[in-house]
Interface confidence: low
């Protein structure tokens, strides 16, 4: 016996071939031997089985000796052995439909589940592979879980059913719902404004929700919610805003804030949450700020960062065009008794310079100047 | 709570047929890979092969051409042949469940394992 | 077939320690390892999956960190029951295969 696989909601084409090529009686049916189709000269006759609307065949291709079954919008249901009788001869075709289906909604919060189920005949024992957009396989049976689901997970899965030794294919697109990053560093000089950009790793045609952002200063005991705002089909309003620090909030997306200004007291780490409309759990993105200042006190010359900064972190004195003067894996350091000139303070990180600022040193009976 | 139970070949002499059935309890065989790992005494644990409830199978390359495995699932029981044995066959064999899923991949239920010794 | 090497092969240490064990795999596997514990004459038990996800049921002492080549479990504070043989084991391609195995001893 054949077995032909076939996807729910497709279209399948069972053969069945006479050895004679000419047109001559066919009739298909089905294992209960109700009449699905046949012919009667040219015409093509319909039996009273529960395919009615949806079964067909090709008479352009009769005169062959070929009188094919075809089956529209597949369902799981329709899996059944189909004889064809034709030349007082009989042709077994075992059709399986099957269906997968993702749970819920094809998309998905970053971090999520993923359950793919598959829909199948009874008395089938199907195995199911699928392969996703990074290229690693999964292999089930009835339902294939994948948890913490990650950026990368976004695309088209692909999905083969097994069944004696036959294959169809399913490909369902997935989109993962987050971020384009899960956490940013900005690096900036006191009094300096302040960016922080947000873009999301997907695209939709209609985005609503809500969102927050929280800052904990690293001076401050406790967080606070800086800024709130509604997102409308894409457009942005702030709800309520603290007034220390006034932020700015772009109208449009990327979502985009801005900081008037860079000061000790704003330096830490923020995160922004967005919760979509008719989606449990939200989104997140992390956001740090790193504040530096170098100054010139009587006879001591200081640069200090705060905010999230890693130890190996390098800070750094230098008079222009000359070697450190002192370079340190702290977050403050000094120079007594500076020589006149420029003088630059840097954060770097492995050689390559994070921030810079930029001192003037007078000689000793002038005031600093700084650029 | 699914158990898993090795049979108990006891002695098999060498180039003979080892065979081995694990029966599952508490639970389907159906929607699961069932796998089998063997360990030397004082070693460490080598895959030998799983099978899926429909009969599908993927074996170690090493063993592939010695190893058979078969489902039962009227009787809950998948089943281990590796033929050809020598006394470097000796070792405990566990039979295990593989948890389906790549993130959740993992084998989370195991029987107690059955000693096999290769003898004349 | 990948490779997976467990270091060391054998370590000794006393209660309340932290005790680091290292896997390493002889290519790219992103973060399908799971680490496993064998008590002697037992069969060995899942403790963690997806290189650091706590399986049901495992003390909180117990974790994992890596992705890549480079894997590490952790025991935050070993306690006499934790001696055992521990097994690291990728699921990246098959065939699946182990590390060959860290047995931990109390001193």
């Known amino acids: 016996k054949k077995v032909v696989l076939g996807k729910k909601g497709d279209t399948v084409e069972l053969t069945c071939t006479a050895s004679q090529k000419k047109s001559i009686q066919f009739h298909w049916k089905n294992s209960n031997q109700i009449k699905i189709l046949g012919n009667q000269g040219s015409f093509l006759t319909k039996g009273p089985s529960k395919l009615n609307d949806r079964a067909d065949s090709r008479r352009s291709l009769w005169d062959q000796g070929n009188f094919p079954l075809i089956i529209k919008n597949l369902k799981i249901e329709d899996s059944d052995t189909y004889i064809c009788e034709v030349e007082d001869q009989k042709e077994e075709v075992q059709l399986l439909v099957f269906g997968l289906t993702a749970n819920s909604d094809t998309h998905l919060l970053q971090g999520q589940s993923l359950t793919l189920t598959l829909e199948s005949p009874p008395g089938s024992s199907p195995s199911v592979q699928c392969r996703s957009p990074r290229g690693k396989n999964i292999q089930g049976g009835k339902t294939l879980s994948v948890s913490q689901l990650e950026l990368q997970d976004s695309g088209t899965w692909t999905c083969t059913v097994l069944q004696n030794q036959k294959k169809v294919e399913f490909k369902i697109d997935i989109v993962v719902l987050a971020f384009q990053k899960a956490s940013s560093i900005v690096y900036k000089k006191e009094g300096e404004q302040v960016e922080f950009s947000f873009p999301l790793a997907f695209t939709v045609e209609k985005l609503t929700g809500s969102g927050e952002l929280w800052w904990q200063a690293e001076r401050a005991s406790s967080s606070k919610s800086w800024i709130t705002f509604d997102l409308k089909n894409k457009e942005v309003s702030v709800k309520r805003v603290t007034q220390d620090p006034k932020l700015q909030m772009g109208k449009k997306l990327p979502l985009h804030l801005t900081l008037p200004q860079a000061l000790p007291q704003y330096a830490g780490s923020g995160n922004l949450t967005l919760a979509l409309e008719a989606k449990t759990g939200k989104l997140h993105q992390e956001v740090n700020l790193v504040v530096m200042r170098a100054t010139q006190l009587q006879k001591n010359l200081t640069c200090e960062v705060w905010g999230p900064t890693s130890p190996k972190l390098m800070l750094s004195l230098k008079l222009e065009n000359k070697e450190a003067k002192v370079s340190k894996r702290e977050k403050a350091v000094w120079v007594l008794n500076p020589e006149a000139g420029m003088w630059q303070c840097l954060l770097s990180d492995s050689g390559q310079v994070l921030l810079e600022s930029n001192i003037k040193v007078l000689p000793t009976w002038s005031t600093p100047v700084q650029p | 709570q699914v158990q898993l139970q090795e049979s108990d070949p006891g002695l098999v002499k060498p180039s003979e047929t080892l065979s081995l059935t694990c029966t599952v309890s508490g639970g389907s065989i159906s929607s699961y890979y069932w796998s089998w790992i063997r360990q030397p005494a004082g070693k460490g644990l080598e895959w030998i092969g799983r099978i899926y409830a429909s009969g599908s199978t993927n074996y170690n390359p090493s063993l592939k051409s010695r190893v058979t495995m078969s489902v039962d699932t009227s009787k809950n029981q998948f089943s281990l042949k590796l033929s050809s044995v020598t006394a470097a066959d000796t070792a405990v064999y566990y039979c295990?469940?593989?948890?389906?899923?790549?993130?959740?991949?993992?084998?989370?239920?195991w029987g107690q394992g059955t000693t096999v010794t290769v003898s004349s | 077939d990948i490779q997976m090497t467990q270091s060391p092969s054998s370590l000794s240490a006393s209660v309340g320690d932290r005790v680091t064990i290292t896997c390493q795999a002889s290519q790219d596997i992103s973060k399908y390892l799971n680490w496993y514990q064998q008590k002697p004459g037992k069969a060995p038990n899942l403790l963690i999956y997806?290189?650091?996800n706590l399986e049901t049921g495992v003390p909180s002492r117990f974790s994992g960190s890596g992705s890549g080549t480079d894997f590490t479990f952790t025991i935050s504070s070993l306690q006499p029951e934790d001696i055992a043989a521990y097994y690291c084991?990728?699921?990246?391609?098959?065939?699946?295969?182990f590390g060959q195995g860290t047995r931990l001893e109390i001193k």
């Open positions: 295990a469940r593989d948890r389906e899923g790549y993130y959740y991949y993992g084998m989370d239920v």
């Open positions: 997806a290189a650091s």
């Open positions: 084991q990728q699921y990246d391609s098959l065939p699946i295969t």
